[in-house]
Amino acid sequence: DAHKSEVAHRFKDLGEENFKALVLIAFAQYLQQCPFEDHVKLVNEVTEFAKTCVADESAENCDKSLHTLFGDKLCTVATLRETYGEMADCCAKQEPERNECFLQHKDDNPNLPRLVRPEVDVMCTAFHDNEETFLKKYLYEIARRHPYFYAPELLFFAKRYKAAFTECCQAADKAACLLPKLDELRDEGKASSAKQRLKCASLQKFGERAFKAWAVARLSQRFPKAEFAEVSKLVTDLTKVHTECCHGDLLECADDRADLAKYICENQDSISSKLKECCEKPLLEKSHCIAEVENDEMPADLPSLAADFVESKDVCKNYAEAKDVFLGMFLYEYARRHPDYSVVLLLRLAKTYETTLEKCCAAADPHECYAKVFDEFKPLVEEPQNLIKQNCELFEQLGEYKFQNALLVRYTKKVPQVSTPTLVEVSRNLGKVGSKCCKHPEAKRMPCAEDYLSVVLNQLCVLHEKTPVSDRVTKCCTESLVNRRPCFSALEVDETYVPKEFNAETFTFHADICTLSEKERQIKKQTALVELVKHKPKATKEQLKAVMDDFAAFVEKCCKADDKETCFAEEGKKLVAASQAALGL
């Protein structure tokens, strides 16, 4: 499938609009600090060049790889060293090292201002004045803040973003129409970014085998009627797509994702009965729909797993002949029977099975040795079941905000060295598992909860990797991808932690808190809670709750006062003194 000109090939496959959008995303994900106008200029130059190659594939430089072309273009940025420091050294390297260098400098937490949403009328005017620039700006702002965002999916978000403005800017009540849609896109976008970040971390930190194992388990749950060979083909193709996107090869990734969607829809009879509606949609919607499609029904009367994987005399022979294929079949068979298990649990079971076979197939009596292997699965299954049941009961008792606070205290005591903003962000997201998953029946709770927790804990891992401060976090993040959640669950209070010095400024609040949204106010209070725990890690939850209740009352009182600022100053001092006394600070 060799083409004289790769850039011409992708331009023709994707079309000009998608080509330009994907190049913009790629550049914004690499050079996260560059101004919008600079990126647009670079994209236009690349697009013009691509058109010359479409016209004549033998034209000068058209035979160069996309990495070479894009890298050369990025390296023309004049302010590279001033803006990015050592990233400029990447430009002295040759491909493929140069691209690897750019990838290593992607920043999961770039120092960029928070995106502030303008007034609806201002947005609608900007949309009408220059729709193309408005939508490009959206792609740019999301891509630079989320350098691993799944690019073809970002095109789908942009399409929905455009549709929201097209509809709502004509509505009688523009704000009532638009704001809920933008909120939904924002929340879905954050979730999509975090899910993709885990896929990239899986590939980059644990390798292709780890990602493929995850994909076998997930696709087998989703398509339990598909044959193993079919699932294997889908896994291979899906791995290629995500490897490309995570590697910055966004044009290839989008092209291959479209091909995969096409293949799935052409072969839906042998894949899943749930794909019909998805396959009637246009490309971007189709791909999104397939990625989110519900699990198909399990085939009737599937035989017991024990026959092939425990009772058979040929277990060790089959394993020795093709280890990964045999383990893949085990994972496929187990996963298609267990849509009620999380993917990470299925992977733990497969790992246990693999470890047992490695040990037993070298033993004097292999069958005797592995005969009870399925008994070893019981505690592995019960552990997340118990944890989820316990968490859901607590969520039911406390509600989301107080449940988040319970997790904030728990995680701050486990890893107090982690920065307060990271602890707040991660614990708030961990706490959302309650409203997201606890409403589900038992059979759907574990895949919802534990796989969501894997995504959130990966956020902690990638943020911590940027500035490592805790050996315990590093250990849980790097030892085993599938055991990250059990590793964090098992962490005890860090007894080596030296409490933070008390700083009254940390607990000084002003009248501006009164104008904040409920969410922002919660974050302020939760930030204070984390700081309290860092000052007094031995404080009981009841002591902390009492202080937090006093704090909430103080904010409510001062926000109702005529002279808010004076109230915050005077009552704030009293609150700090009372809290110090209550906690023995």
Epitope: N386, L387, E393, L394, Q397, K413, K541, E542, K545
Partner: nanobody, 122 residues
Framework: QVQLVESGGGLVQAGGSLRLSCAAS????????MGWFRQAPGKERVFVAT???????YYADSVKGRFTISRDHAKNTVYLQMNNLKPEDTAVYYC????????????????WGQGTQVTVSS
């Protein structure tokens, strides 16, 4: 202040039974998770069983099927019925309580009793 007082420990033959009680005072415990940990000589404290505010029960694998945890909300008391005791159950048993009772680690529980000795002879 909060107090947890255990009782019911003692010396018992292997295969025998004991019933531990834990009376909680100092506040209302009806919304707390309550439970039991144990510590054998020279070992760490380990989880035995816990019961939630909704009376859902959780057990360590080593005691499942032999021990039963229950509570009386009105009396602020939690019980541990221990049957078919084994020598390896010998330990000091601690009653625990926590308003959030999330997890199975010792540090997940803020309130601890003084402990009651259980010795199982073979």
């Amino acid at each position: 202040q909060v107090q947890l007082v255990e009782s019911g420990g003692g010396l018992v033959q292997a295969g025998g039974s004991l019933r531990l009680s834990c009376a909680a005072s100092g506040r209302t415990f009806s919304n707390d998770a309550m439970g039991w940990f144990r510590q054998a000589p020279g070992k760490e404290r380990v989880f035995v069983a816990t019961i939630s505010w909704k009376s859902s029960t959780y057990y360590a694998d080593s005691v499942k099927g032999r021990f039963t945890i229950s509570r009386d909300h009105a009396k602020n008391t939690v019980y541990l019925q221990m049957n078919n005791l084994k020598p390896e159950d010998t330990a000091v048993y601690y009653c625990v309580a926590d308003p959030y009772g999330l997890g199975f680690n010792p540090s997940d529980y803020d309130y601890w009793g003084q402990g009651t000795q259980v010795t199982v002879s073979s």
